[in-house]
């Protein structure tokens, strides 16, 4: 029997299906002659009088005619009709208002498969969590990149949920971005918090230049610090040229006087002269660059009475040069625990770090490291590689500082140093790491995971394995099996359940004999190659009452592939209406080469089977 294939909702471009869809829209009153959204979109809804007389072909309708629809009337449409409407609007490139887009999105109840056919900006209003899995999310965010993110204000919940989901999808760990990452984020790159700007200035600053809205305080501080630091791509302000100033155009409002004073005076004067002739330059950017360039005399000696005797709140009011001149590095090192309690600015922290670097050029001692507090966030991976961290207390103290954030390159380096120092990932360390970073285990390579002793597996919680791929579970499953081997049936299943994505067929067969009632979510995470050899009876026993859930998953792996391997007769015994099994009278030839190429078994119909039987009979008689 033929497998059912999904019929496209609409025929190929401009087919009668679209005409009848529009006829339906008109008759439902979705496209209304008098409604106009000119204020929102710059388009005007055209009158549709007479259009209803002849069901129109979509190509004969202008975008203006499709423009106005009130949200209230969408609720009367089925999900399928809403999707058809969305596709029609996309094909005619109709610009919709935020409200219309939100309204359509709410009515698309399940994650649409045909993302490419939907209006680009509609995707902004869909929940990114619905596109989990590397392929689905990649397709989703590749489209989002091209959408106009600025339809949504920065504070809008729909916009706020996009960035974390995009970073997770593109596999960004910590705050270090590549050029490709920034490209992949599209307009969402403008929402990246300051720590990304600090870590990835080289690739991110050129992107921030063209962000439409103003940067927030956090981004501004980080951009200012990066530009003042003089790293790539712009180099030290003292070397900037007029073309650098042009390139920095969108970031000029964040520069601040210390940077401006470092730019050669002639360059600023030339740039100001030219930009004053060019009306495209906005006023705020010019007013920042006042002709005020007398460099202050270098101040190096500590003013009398300002020498710091202890690290306390009075230092908040010190200028950077005063901190540099008046705070003794040894005093700082012995009172590091106080720094954490005092609200210094980022710029002041830079000075304090610089003092510690001068005192300990070979790397900080653990007594200082343990009390770094949020100064740890100022450390680079290079700084951390010089450290020798042996105490779990120190590790915990520093992880606490980064709590609630993604794992940064600093944290990754710190953990690496710590684990290498210990020689293996013992239970206490794993306990600590997974408490702070539930996804930590899944960030390790299969090779690194092989050094995890089975005893440590007891520290692993189900959520710690959420992002593990099959290769990682292949390594972890045997360890878990060993760790939990002395538990009885039901207790064993509870513990082993989250590791089963690495289980072989024989273990699944064994579990099917133990009345475990595996839930569908666990079943869907099993290795396809481990599920395929299971019989219908084994799957029924394995799932118990959850077997009914197979129907809802029949188009998804591994259920789809498993169905293809079963005899339709056997599937029918489940009474679930599963379709796509091997019909009666067909012979399955497991031609591994053919299957490797096509991904499906080779089926021979009754004719060839009779031929094969005749040949077998003849050879027997001979």
């Amino acid at each position: 029997m033929a497998l059912p294939t999904a019929r496209p909702l609409l025929g190929s471009c401009g087919t009668p299906a679209l005409g009848s869809l529009l006829f339906l829209l008109f008759s439902l009153g979705w496209v209304q002659p008098s409604r106009t959204l000119a204020g929102e979109t710059g388009q005007e809804a055209a009158p549709l009088d007479g259009v209803l007389a002849n069901p129109p072909n979509i190509s004969s309708l202008s975008p203006r005619q499709l423009l106005g629809f009130p949200c209230a009337e969408v609720s009367g449409l089925s999900t399928e009709r809403v999707r058809e409407l969305a596709v029609a609007l996309a094909q005619k490139n109709v610009k919709l208002s935020t409200e219309q887009l939100r309204c359509l999105a709410h009515r698309l109840s399940e994650p649409p498969e045909d993302l490419d056919a939907l209006p680009l900006d509609l995707l902004l209003f869909l929940n990114p969590d619905a596109f989990s899995g590397p392929q689905a999310c990649t397709r989703f965010f590749s489209r989002i990149t091209k959408a106009n993110v600025d339809l949504l204000p920065r504070g809008a919940p729909e916009r706020q949920r996009l960035l974390p989901a995009a970073l997770a999808c593109w596999g960004v760990r910590g705050s270090l971005l590549s050029e490709a990452d920034v490209r992949a984020l599209g307009g969402l790159a403008c929402d990246l918090p300051g720590r990304f700007v600090a870590e990835s200035a080289e690739v991110l600053l050129p992107r921030l230049v063209s962000c439409p809205g103003p940067l927030d305080q956090d981004q501004q501080e980080a951009a200012r610090a990066a530009l003042q630091g003089g790293g790539p791509p712009y180099g030290p302000p003292s070397t900037w040229s007029v073309s650098t100033m042009d390139a920095l155009r969108g970031l000029l409002p964040v520069l601040g006087q210390p940077i401006i004073r470092s730019i050669p005076q002639g360059i600023v004067a030339a740039w100001r002269q030219r930009s004053s002739r060019d009306p495209s330059w906005r006023q705020p950017e010019r007013t920042i660059l006042r002709p005020r360039f007398r460099r202050e005399v270098e101040k190096t000696a500590c003013p009398s009475g300002k020498k710091a005797r202890e690290i306390d709140e009075s230092l908040i009011f010190y200028k950077k040069w005063e901190l540099e001149a008046c705070v003794d590095a040894a005093l700082l090192a012995t009172q590091m625990d106080r720094v954490n309690a005092i609200p210094f600015t980022y710029e002041q922290l830079d000075v304090l770090k610089h003092k510690l670097d001068e005192l300990y050029p070979q790397g900080y001692p653990e007594s200082v490291i343990q009390h770094l507090g949020y100064l740890f966030l100022k450390m680079s991976p290079e700084d951390i590689r010089k450290w020798n961290v042996t105490s779990l207390e120190t590790l915990k103290a520093l992880l606490e500082v980064n709590k609630g954030h993604e794992m940064s390159p600093q944290v990754a380096t710190l953990i690496d140093r710590f684990v290498k120092g210990r020689g293996q990932l013992d239970k206490d360390t794993l306990d600590t790491l997974t408490a702070f970073y539930p996804g930590y285990l899944c960030s390790l390579s299969p090779e690194e995971l092989s050094s995890v002793p089975p005893s440590s597996i007891w520290a692993v919680r189900p959520q710690d394995l959420d992002t593990c791929d099959p290769r990682q579970l292949d390594v972890l499953y045997p360890k878990a099996r060993l760790a939990f081997q002395n538990m009885n049936g039901s207790e064993y299943f509870v513990k082993i359940q989250s590791f089963l994505g690495g289980a072989p067929t024989e273990d699944l067969k064994a579990l099917s004999q133990q009345n475990v009632s595996m839930d569908l979510a666990t079943f869907m995470k099993l290795r396809t190659d481990a599920v395929l050899p299971l019989t219908v009876a084994e799957v029924q026993k394995l799932l118990g009452p959850h077997v009914e859930g197979l129907k809802a998953e029949e188009r998804h792996r591994p259920v789809r592939d498993w169905i293809l391997r079963q005899r339709q007769d056997d599937l029918d015994t489940l009474g679930l209406g599963l379709q796509g099994g091997i019909p009666n009278g067909y012979l399955v030839l497991d031609l591994s080469m053919q299957e490797a190429l096509s991904g499906t078994p080779c089926l021979l119909g009754p004719g060839p089977v009779l031929t094969v039987l005749a040949l077998l009979l003849a050879s027997t008689l001979a």
């Epitope: 956090d218 609200p343 210094f344 949020y374």
Partner: nanobody
Framework: QVQLVESGGGTVQAGGSLKLACAAS????????MGWFRQAPGKEREGVAI????????YYRDSVKGRATISQDNAKKSVSLQMNSLRPEDTAIYYC????????????WGQGTQVTVSS
């Protein structure tokens, strides 16, 4: 969404007084320090005064000691800065700031209010 909104800025004669107010909304319950920073044209941003909201302890920069008073109204999650005997060098944009305990640099900043002292 945390918002700090400053008010009370303006132009005043040297020797005059001004009271800046900062209304906070959306601050986490755990925040424990509020304060005022300022930035004059062409100068580094600098702290003016801070107050620990839990203990009421206050700290001032040397140049405003005796002339400035920072105070809080816990019920309204607001903080004010009374500035007396104003000098031309007090001319700056004044920013309200807030922070949670041990959380790193000032996390929350207002948009700023301009104070101009004319001689």
């Amino acid at each position: 969404q945390v918002q700090l909104v400053e008010s009370g800025g303006g132009t005043v004669q040297a020797g005059g007084s001004l009271k800046l107010a900062c209304a906070a909304s959306g601050l986490p319950r755990t925040y424990n320090v509020m304060g005022w920073f300022r930035q004059a044209p062409g100068k580094e941003r600098e702290g003016v005064a801070i107050i620990y909201t839990t203990t009421g302890a206050t700290y001032y920069r040397d140049s405003v000691k005796g002339r400035a008073t920072i105070s809080q109204d816990n019920a309204k999650k607001s903080v004010s800065l009374q500035m007396n005997s104003l000098r031309p060098e007090d001319t700056a944009i004044y920013y309200c700031v807030a922070r949670q305990p041990n959380s790193g640099p000032w996390e929350y900043w207002g948009q700023g209010t301009q104070v101009t002292v004319s001689s």
